[in-house]
Interface confidence: medium
C-alpha cells in the first residue's frame, strides 16, 4: 500500500475530465490536486464517477477546506451535495440566494432531507431574518416550509415577506403558527380594498380574533365553509347569528352539514334557538327560549 501513495508517472491530472473515471481510488487520491478539483467542481457532475470515486473527491475537498467549503465550491457541488452530512454543512457560510437555489434544485422533488434542513437553517440564521426573496425561494421548493417553523421562528418573518406566501403554503400550519402569521398578514395587506384584501387574508384567518371577524362580516365577503371551519373556536363563539350570516353570505347553508363539528357545534350551543331558527336551516342545540345566559368569564373579569 505504501508505494501506491505516489502518483504514477504521467498520471498527474491536468484537469478534471472523463479520463479520471479509469483511475483507481488511490490514483485519484494521489494524482488529483485538491485545488484543481475546487476550481473545476462544475465539471464533476457531468463525469460518471463511481460512488467510491466521489467519496475520494469529497475527501480531498474536506482536507483542503477543514473549516468548511467556500461558497464558490458549494455553488457547484451539484449532486455531490447529497454526499454531504449535516455536520459538513454546519461548517458552511452560505450567503448567496443563488447558491441556496442551486443546492435546493439538487433535492427538488424529494422530501426535505437532513442536509437540506441544515442548509436552510444555516442560510436563514446567516441572513438574520426570513426576507421575502428567501421565503419565495423556500416555499417554491417546499410549500410546507413555513408551517415547519416554530412560532418563535415565524416571529422573525417580516410582514413584507407575507406577500410571497401562497394559500397552499399554509395548509399544514396549526393555530399557534397562524396566530403569529395573521397579524403580519393584516399589516402586509392593510392598504388593499375590501374584496382584494379578503382574497389575500383568507388563508391566514385561522389566526384572526373575534373583532376582525366581526369587521369582515360587515364587508359582504361571502366566506366559504372550508375557511370558516378553520377559524379559531374562541374567535367564532362570540359572533351573533346575524354576524355569521353576513360573514358566510350564500354559504351559510353549509352550516347544517357541519353542525356536529367544531367550531360550528360549539357556536350553536352559544346561540339562542330563536335566532338559529331565523336561518331556516333546522340547526338544533341552541339555548331554549326563556333561558337566561350568564357570561361567567365576564363576571370573573369584573370581580
Amino acid at each position: 500500500e505504501v508505494e501506491k501513495t505516489a502518483c504514477p508517472s504521467g498520471k498527474k491530472a491536468r484537469e478534471i475530465d472523463e479520463s479520471l473515471i479509469f483511475y483507481k481510488k488511490w490514483e485519484l487520491e494521489a494524482c488529483v490536486d485538491a485545488a484543481l478539483l475546487a476550481t473545476q467542481m462544475d465539471r464533476v457532475n457531468a463525469i460518471p464517477f463511481t460512488y467510491e470515486q466521489l467519496d475520494v473527491l469529497k475527501h480531498k475537498l474536506d482536507e483542503l477546506y477543514p473549516q468548511g467549503y467556500p461558497e464558490s465550491v458549494i455553488q457547484h457541488l451539484g449532486y455531490l451535495f447529497l454526499k454531504m452530512s449535516p455536520e459538513d454543512i454546519r461548517k458552511w457560510n452560505v450567503t448567496s440566494l443563488e447558491t441556496l437555489k442551486a443546492l435546493l434544485e439538487v433535492n427538488k422533488g424529494h422530501e426535505m432531507s437532513p442536509q437540506v434542513a441544515t442548509l436552510i437553517d444555516r442560510f436563514v440564521k446567516g441572513r438574520g431574518q426570513l426576507d421575502k426573496d428567501t421565503l419565495d425561494t423556500l416555499t417554491a421548493f417546499y410549500p410546507g416550509y413555513l408551517c415547519s417553523l416554530s412560532p418563535e421562528e415565524l416571529s422573525s418573518v417580516p410582514p413584507s415577506s407575507i406577500w410571497a406566501v401562497r394559500p397552499q403554503d399554509l395548509d399544514t400550519c396549526d393555530p399557534r403558527q397562524l396566530d403569529v402569521l395573521y397579524p403580519k398578514a393584516r399589516l402586509a395587506f392593510q392598504n388593499m380594498n375590501g374584496s382584494e384584501y379578503f382574497v389575500k387574508i383568507q388563508s391566514f384567518l385561522g389566526g384572526a380574533p373575534t373583532e376582525d371577524l366581526k369587521a369582515l362580516s360587515q364587508q359582504n365577503v361571502s366566506m366559504d365553509l372550508a375557511t370558516f371551519m378553520k377559524l379559531r373556536t374562541d374567535a367564532v363563539l362570540p359572533l351573533t347569528v346575524a354576524e355569521v350570516q353576513k360573514l358566510l353570505g350564500p354559504h351559510v347553508e353549509g352550516l347544517k352539514a357541519e353542525e356536529r363539528h367544531r367550531p360550528v357545534r360549539d357556536w350553536i350551543l352559544r346561540q339562542r334557538q330563536d335566532d338559529l331558527d331565523t336561518l331556516g336551516l333546522g340547526l338544533q342545540g341552541g339555548i331554549p327560549n326563556g333561558y337566561l345566559v350568564l357570561d361567567l368569564s365576564m363576571q370573573e373579569a369584573l370581580s
Epitope: E18, I21, N45, A46, I47, P48, T50, Y51, E52, D55, G78, Y79, L82, K83, E105, V106, K108, G109, H110, S113
Partner: antibody
C-alpha cells in the same frame, strides 16, 4: 413528485430498431444521470448505461455498446434509448431510472416484444 | 466486471420469522445497495450505502457487511415482504446486480 413516464409496450420486428422514451417530471432534469436497465421475463436486472442530460455524456455497459444509443431532449425533459438490430434476446422490460444514494425513481418500464 | 452472487436463490419464511439473505462480490466493494421487486412492478430501493434505510422503508429491514460479503435482514417477515431482492454495486463500471433472491411466504 418525481416521475418517469414510459410507454407501456412496443412490438417490433426482428432486425428493426426501436426508440424508447422516458419523460421526466418533478425535478430538475439536467442535474441527474439517467440510467437504463433491462429485465428479461423471469430474469434479473442488467444495467445498460447512463446519460447526463446537461452534457450529453454517456457511459455504457460494454455488453450493450453496439445495441443501445442513449440521447436526451432537454427541452421536453425526455430521455431516449434506441435499440438496434433487434432479436428475440432483446425482448424484455426496459426501465429508465434515477439511482442516487438515498433515493431512486424508476419508470414503469416499457415491454419490448420482438416478433415477426 | 464485479459479479454479485446472491444466496439462496429462493427461500420461504413464515410471518414473524427472521430472514437473512447474502450477496457475495467477486472483488471488494465499499458499498452495497439492495432493491425489492414485486411481480409486475418496478424495483424499489431499500438500503443504500450498505446499511442505511431508504425513505419509507420499514425499520424491520436492515443491511450490513463489508468488502466482499454483504447481507440483508428482515427482522420479522410480513406478507407484504414476499418479493425478489437484488443487491447492486456501484464501485466500478459496469454497475452490476445480483441474480436475485426470491422470498416467498410460507
Amino acid at each position: 413528485q418525481v416521475q418517469l413516464q414510459q410507454p407501456g409496450a412496443e412490438l417490433v420486428k426482428p432486425g428493426a430498431s426501436v426508440k424508447l422514451s422516458c419523460k421526466a417530471s418533478g425535478y430538475t432534469f439536467t442535474i441527474y444521470w439517467m440510467h437504463w436497465v433491462k429485465q428479461r421475463p423471469g430474469q434479473g436486472l442488467e444495467w445498460i448505461g447512463m446519460i447526463h442530460p446537461n452534457s450529453g455524456n454517456t457511459n455504457y455497459n460494454e455488453k450493450f455498446k453496439s445495441k443501445a444509443t442513449l440521447t436526451v431532449d432537454k427541452s421536453s425533459s425526455t430521455a431516449y434509448m434506441q435499440l438496434s438490430s433487434l432479436t428475440s434476446e432483446d425482448s424484455a422490460v426496459y426501465y429508465c431510472s434515477l439511482i442516487h444514494w438515498y433515493f431512486d425513481v424508476w419508470g414503469t418500464g416499457t415491454t419490448v416484444t420482438v416478433s415477426s | 466486471q464485479i459479479v454479485l452472487t446472491q444466496s439462496p436463490a429462493i427461500m420461504s419464511a413464515s410471518p414473524g420469522e427472521k430472514v437473512t439473505m447474502t450477496c457475495s462480490a467477486s472483488s471488494s466493494v465499499s458499498y452495497m445497495y439492495w432493491y425489492q421487486q414485486k411481480p409486475g412492478s418496478s424495483p424499489r430501493l431499500l438500503i443504500y450505502d450498505t446499511s442505511n434505510l431508504a425513505s419509507g422503508v420499514p425499520v424491520r429491514f436492515s443491511g450490513s457487511g463489508s468488502g466482499t460479503s454483504y447481507s440483508l435482514t428482515i427482522s420479522r417477515m410480513e406478507a407484504e415482504d414476499a418479493a425478489t431482492y437484488y443487491c447492486q454495486q456501484w464501485s466500478s463500471y459496469p454497475l452490476t446486480f445480483g441474480a436475485g433472491t426470491k422470498l416467498e411466504l410460507k
